[in-house]
Interface confidence: low
């Protein structure tokens, strides 16, 4: 079976301040088992934006029902975008592990730029 790929189709997305940003991400396989997380940034200081497994992320909604059987769409929408939200967002697949899940594969990233609110 082909190894899972994490596909972020848009290299960049531009959104006006105050609007919602949709960041698209899809997997090519259900294997390996494990959660999806979204991060802003790629290195050690990356910020967790959404964790499928746990946590409270009031500004983030998932585009499709993640608990649905055979779901491969892990796109998210972030509401009320501000200039501080600008950055590169990575969709990351984790492999279920004990005691901790292990990072398996990252998407190529989608750069979010924020335009001034139209007057």
């Amino acid at each position: 079976e082909d190894e899972l790929q994490v596909i972020q189709p848009e290299k960049s997305v531009s959104v006006a301040a105050g609007e919602s940003a949709t960041l698209r991400c899809a997997m090519t396989s259900l294997i390996p088992v494990g959660p999806i997380m979204w991060f802003r940034g790629a290195g050690a200081g990356r910020e967790l934006i959404y964790n499928q497994k746990e946590g409270h992320f009031p500004r983030v909604t998932t585009v499709s029902e993640l608990t649905k059987r055979n779901n491969l769409d892990f796109s998210i929408s972030i509401s009320n975008i501000t200039p501080a939200d600008a950055g590169t967002y990575y969709c990351v697949k984790f492999r279920k592990g004990s005691p901790d899940d292990v990072e398996f594969k990252s998407g190529a990233g989608t750069e979010l730029s924020v335009r001034a609110k139209p007057s």
Epitope: G43, P83, G87, S106, A108
Partner: antibody, heavy 120, light 112 residues
């Protein structure tokens, strides 16, 4: 002017706590993180941890876990680093540094440092 | 933790001559996004460190073009094409791919 201005030197007794401040100006404080790095006399640089001014997320060096707390006050664009249960080997210059961009965690702006001396 | 090893420890230089500092990491610093999470800093005597190079080879704002960074994976080099008197100080490499970010031990550059 883009700068980080740190609080003044401190002399503390072993077992005490110290809180160092770092006031940012000239840029949008919430667009970056603040990292804290210390340097013992004549030694190299040691990363202590960082805090996101964007959402308050923190990450601390394991050896300091439980003794260090990093906070921000976005209303005054100020970051704070508190270190508790001070020991003599905590004597160092403590620097705050701006994390250039949370995509690329280089430290592109540094404060001038705060000397903390721990002595009985 | 990722261990960063710099060499040499000390580097006596002649103004106008080139200089080179090596930095090795115990793990690859190349992320799948194509960037090497390796930065170079200079700490001049009595001053705070200042950023020279970020993400392996990108010169920071205001840094003279005589400074260049190269390398990928685990082996990196900082080159000064023509050393000037103001370049003296301690040079540090630092990785930020994994927490905790770690610094090399430093290379002291001094004029011969």
């Amino acid at each position: 002017q883009v700068q980080l201005v740190q609080s003044g030197a401190e002399v503390k007794k072993p077992g005490a706590s110290v809180k160092v401040s770092c006031k940012a100006s000239g840029y949008t404080f919430t667009s970056n993180g603040i990292s804290w790095v210390r340097q013992a006399p004549g030694q190299g640089l040691e990363w202590m941890g960082w805090i996101s001014a964007y959402n308050g997320n923190t990450n601390y060096a394991q050896k300091l876990q439980g003794r260090v707390t990093m906070t921000t006050d976005t209303s005054t664009s100020t970051a704070y680093m508190e270190l508790r249960s001070l020991r003599s080997d905590d004597t160092a210059v403590y620097y705050c540094a701006r994390v250039g961009n949370m995509d690329q965690e280089y430290f592109d702006l540094w404060g001038r440092g705060t000397l903390v001396t721990v002595s009985s | 933790d990722i261990v960063m090893t710099q060499s040499p420890l000390s580097l006596p230089v002649t103004p106008g001559e080139p200089a080179s500092i090596s930095c090795r990491s115990s793990q690859s610093l190349l992320h799948s996004n194509g960037y090497n999470y390796l930065d170079w800093y200079l700490q001049k005597p009595g001053q705070s460190p200042q950023l020279l190079i970020y993400l392996g080879s990108n010169r920071a704002s205001g840094v003279p073009d005589r400074f260049s960074g190269s390398g990928s994976g685990t082996d990196f080099t900082l080159k000064i094409s023509r050393v000037e008197a103001e370049d003296v100080g301690v040079y540090y490499c630092m990785q930020t791919l994994r927490i905790p970010p770690t610094f090399g031990g430093g290379t002291k550059v001094e004029i011969k």
